[in-house]
């Protein structure tokens, strides 16, 4: 039994590291294999994490761990029974991949604007609280070719948009995603979209020529 | 040995201001978040705030928004907490606190006290 | 603010006997990441505190077995089997979960 591809991790950098690694061959992760990990500091124990498949000879760890600094370094330990496979070393701030935003909500209530919300993943004593900033995606469930994104650049997590800048009649869907920039991450997952009708009124001088009013960004 | 050591007690008039330090030794501060805790005389314990040293990223409690600043300077391995407009109420011990991610470490702690 | 009730605010134990605190969150104390970080302190007389007790349930380093925690949820006690002359002091229970993170008042534990 060999390692083919090494372990790679990514830090979600609050609580979870994944780690994804693959086998020379079919391999049953969670009964073959233990992955053992220990933080680089004082009184610090060895966990174990049990993997799980991902693809026939692909395997998957998901490690806990109780909070994160910029420093932090783990040392990683791949185990089959007795026999050591691979030894490595972590650092979660230099592969950090942030949680998805959640609770995205479009309020419509005001007529000619339109205003999203989401929740910032992070809670306030984490370091990525405070340096996120999202990527909103709107597109038509009508109109495969009517896509936008916002890069929304600042910390607050809301996005307000004119209702005329999309069709009104139809249906849209939003998503939001997540980054930061001082540990130059990877952007997160999507968050899960969030459907609604776009039913802004135009007055009649611009009825005819609501084709002008259509941005992408 | 793992130690925090504090500065020495602090007698200071009132509108004054007051820096006390703690120095790590047997670990790096980069390696945790360094706290500060509040103990009036014959009180208990209040948590104060805390700093991430590597980024210098501070949480303060919203009492202490504003009187405390808390920075760090890990070529020297020390933390610092700075109180200003200095009243009587401030007077009590400080102590400096590893936390990773529990308090396993504290300093022996500051007297400061506030008198004119 | 989570506010951290303790129960009683002293205690009087005769060596050997058991003892028992209580501590009260105000709300839930779990982490967002799945955690409840809820710790116990002893503050002996003229010294800093020391840890007992974190993560609820676990021993720290060096510390007696005579010494446990449990609960979830709010509510947390800290159990002491058989008393002895050197666990005099003020024990305090601590919510490391939400910012501001908060201490318990306080309970004294002295020996009849």
């Known amino acids: 039994m060999k390692v083919l591809q090494e372990p790679t991790c990514v830090s979600d950098y609050m609580s979870i590291s994944t780690c994804e690694w693959k086998m020379n061959g079919p391999t049953n992760c969670s009964t073959e294999l233990r992955l053992l990990y220990q933080l680089v500091f004082l009184l610090s124990e060895a966990h174990t994490c049990i993997p799980e498949n991902n693809g026939g000879a692909g395997c998957v760890c998901h490690l806990l761990m109780d909070d994160v600094v910029s420093a932090d370094n783990y040392t990683l330990d791949l185990w089959a029974g007795q026999q050591l496979l691979w030894k490595g070393s972590f650092k979660p701030s230099e592969h950090v991949k942030p949680r998805a935003p959640g609770n995205l909500t479009v309020h419509t209530n005001v007529s000619d604007t339109l205003l999203l919300t989401w929740s910032n993943p992070y809670p306030p004593d984490n370091y990525l609280y405070n340096h996120l900033t999202y990527a909103v995606n709107i597109w038509s469930e009508n109109d495969p070719a009517d896509f936008r994104i916002y890069n929304v650049t600042y910390l607050e997590p809301s996005l307000r948009i004119a209702a005329s800048t999309l069709k009104s009649g139809i249906s849209y869907r939003a998503r939001v995603r997540a980054w930061a920039q001082c540990y130059n991450t990877t952007w997160s997952e999507w968050s899960p979209s969030t459907k609604w009708h776009n039913s802004y009124r135009e007055p009649f001088e611009q009825h005819h020529h609501h084709h002008h009013h259509h941005h992408h960004h | 040995e793992v130690q925090l050591v504090q500065s020495g007690a602090e007698v200071k008039k009132p509108g004054a201001t007051v820096k006390i330090s703690c120095k790590a030794s047997?670990?790096?501060?980069?390696?945790?978040?360094m706290h500060w805790v509040k103990q009036a005389p014959g009180k208990g314990l209040e948590w104060v705030g805390r700093?991430?040293?590597?980024?210098?990223?501070?949480i303060y409690a919203s009492k202490f928004q504003g009187k405390v600043t808390i920075t760090a300077d890990t070529s020297s391995n020390t933390a610092y907490m700075e109180l200003s407009s200095l009243r009587s109420e401030d007077t009590a011990v400080y102590h400096c606190?590893?936390?990773?991610?529990?308090?396993?470490?504290w300093g022996q702690g500051t007297l400061v006290t506030v008198s004119s | 603010d989570i506010v951290m009730t303790q129960t009683p605010l002293s205690l009087s134990v005769t060596p050997g006997q058991p003892a028992s605190i209580s501590c009260r969150s105000s709300?839930?104390?779990?982490?967002?990441?799945?955690?409840?970080?809820l710790e116990w302190y002893l503050q002996k007389p003229g010294q800093s505190p020391q840890l007992l007790i974190y993560?609820?349930?676990n021993r720290f380093s060096g510390v007696p077995d005579r010494f446990s925690g449990s609960g979830s949820g709010t509510d947390f006690t800290l159990k002491i089997s058989r008393v002895e002359a050197e666990d005099v002091g003020v024990y305090y229970c601590f919510q490391g979960s939400h910012v501001p993170y908060t201490f318990g008042q306080g309970t004294k534990l002295e020996i009849k």
């Open positions: 709300q839930s104390i779990v982490h967002s990441n799945g955690n409840t970080y």
């Open positions: 700093i991430d040293p590597t980024n210098g990223y501070t």
């Open positions: 047997g670990f790096n501060i980069k390696d945790t978040y």
């Open positions: 606190v590893s936390r990773r991610p529990w308090f396993a470490y």
């Open positions: 993560k609820v349930t």
